[in-house]
């Protein structure tokens, strides 16, 4: 079974309604919004909570320089249109026919159009930068062991192999988490880059996903890790297509 | 000092259940990410199945899986194996096993192992 | 799945000598490999991690070479206490594997 067994709760994604109504009376969870089963025993797709928070009652809310190419989510919040498989739909709209694409964690990576707007594939983010400052501490963490702690937490925490966590950069305050994940490197049932850092992102605003789970206490040897600040990054395998005219704005 | 000790070891029928156990002493369970690996009488070393920390994150060998539970309990710095539906080719000693601490899935200690013969 | 594939089977070396045992991987697995000494009637011990990390306590005549696919472990001078079956594992991806052993023996 994928939820736990004995109460009917999805571990990994508490923005589920949960019933004994599987194959042989197993616990099933389909995500809010949405209504797709989904596996309890890894993490849900971006794409889904997304479309599960949108449905939510609205109160519920060296170091590397970014490439040109790179994308912020500035757009906020919407409600997506996932596929059958819980991913983001390349084209995305809204309810007055305003559409543009987006790219596998589902930022927008072209100008906004109309339903004339063609998206042809997905183009999948191959490349993410975490970027934080913490909070003062007495001293700067060591960096070796700041590096060993965020590994273990993408590990422990989001089901990340280690060998996607690219590189841990530190500049106090500043630490930066590079993920890297090729279409060829993701092997079935390896957690997506996108959606481990957007369950990262949740846990350092304290809007922890997960059930039951305790909040995210991030140390290093024994010192809290206190986030302030996230940026996030994202590098599309194929560059993001803009006008020039928001470039220059 | 780590100490693993298995034990729930024994002979059962082709079909049969059995649920292994692992006390752990000597470190801090509750932040280790734990195994089971097994060896065939005369034969190799085979992974069976790894469980997180705080016990979310799950994985199982293909030879196991939908046959086989990994659980633990950290409050009583246990670890447990549930076998269903065995088979001959099941017939192994278990070793508990500790993973390494950073989370990369070698392992550092190893318990001394209970056989579980499966056989009619 | 990744498959281990270790060679020989089986070795014969003099005390003294300076023995290789290799493990090649069917993709390539970086670093992200491990060696395992299991003496006679013992359980596994690790040995190396990390494909070149020596492992606490483990004597220094012992070491680790390689990345990608072609891994070594080399015994510089081989002592009675090292007779066992040799081990490598990959964890590379979420299902490890070990490769089939190398026993060790003395002349």
């Known amino acids: 079974h994928t939820a736990a067994q004995d109460n009917c709760t999805c571990p990994t994604n508490k923005m589920t309604v949960c019933s004994p109504d599987g194959p042989g009376g197993r616990c099933q969870c389909r995500a809010l919004g949405s209504g797709m089963a989904v596996d309890c025993s890894t993490l849900t797709s971006k794409c889904l909570l997304l479309k599960a928070r949108m449905s939510a009652p609205k109160n519920a809310r060296t170091l590397v320089r970014p490439s040109e190419h790179a994308l912020v989510d500035n757009d906020g919040l919407y409600d997506p249109d996932c596929d059958p498989e819980g991913r983001f739909k390349a084209r995305q709209c809204n309810q007055t026919s305003v559409c543009w694409c987006v790219n596998s964690v589902g930022v927008r990576r072209t100008d906004k159009g109309d339903l004339s707007l063609r998206c042809d594939e997905l183009v999948r983010t191959h490349h993410i930068l975490i970027d934080l400052r913490h909070r003062p501490t007495a001293g700067a963490f060591n960096h070796s062991d700041l590096d060993a702690e965020l590994r273990r937490l993408f590990r422990e925490r989001y089901r990340l192999h280690p060998k996607f966590v690219a590189a841990v950069h530190y500049e106090q305050p500043t630490i930066q988490i590079e993920l890297r994940q090729n279409t060829s490197q993701k092997a079935a049932g390896d957690v997506d880059i996108g959606d481990a850092a957007y369950y990262f992102e949740r846990d350092i605003k304290g809007e922890s996903l997960f059930q039951g789970r305790g909040g995210l206490d991030l140390r290093v040897r024994g010192e809290p890790l206190q986030v302030e600040r996230t940026l996030i990054y994202y590098l599309d395998e194929i560059p993001p297509k803009f006008s020039m005219k928001r470039l220059t704005a | 000092e780590v100490q693993l000790v298995e034990s729930g070891g024994g002979l059962v029928q082709p079909g049969g259940s059995l649920r292994l156990s692992c006390a752990a002493s000597?470190?801090?369970?509750?932040?280790?990410?734990m195994s089971w690996v097994r060896q065939a009488p005369g034969k190799g070393l085979e992974w069976v199945a790894n469980i997180n920390s705080d016990g979310y994150n799950i994985y199982y060998s293909d030879s196991v899986k939908g046959r086989f539970t990994i659980s633990r309990d950290n409050a009583k710095n246990s670890l447990y194996l549930q076998m269903n539906s065995l088979r001959a080719e099941d017939t192994a000693v278990y070793y508990c096993?500790?993973?390494?601490?950073?989370?990369?899935?070698?392992?550092?200690?190893w318990g001394q192992g209970t056989l579980v013969t499966v056989s009619s | 799945d990744i498959q281990m594939t270790q060679s020989p089977s089986s070795l014969s070396a003099s005390v003294g000598d300076r023995v290789t045992i290799t493990c090649r991987a069917s993709?390539?697995?970086?670093?992200?490999l491990a060696w395992y000494q299991q003496k006679p009637g013992k359980v596994p011990k690790l040995l190396i991690y990390a494909a070149t990390n020596l492992a606490d306590g483990v004597p220094s005549r012992f070491s680790g070479s390689g990345s990608g696919t072609d891994f070594t472990l080399t015994i510089s001078s081989l002592q009675p206490e090292d007779v066992a079956t040799y081990y490598c594992q990959h964890y590379y991806s979420n299902q490890l594997t070990f490769g089939q052993g190398t026993k060790l023996e003395i002349k």
């Open positions: 000597g470190f801090t369970f509750s932040t280790y990410t």
């Open positions: 993709e390539n697995i970086d670093n992200y």
């Open positions: 096993v500790r993973c390494s601490y950073y989370s990369y899935d070698y392992f550092d200690y």
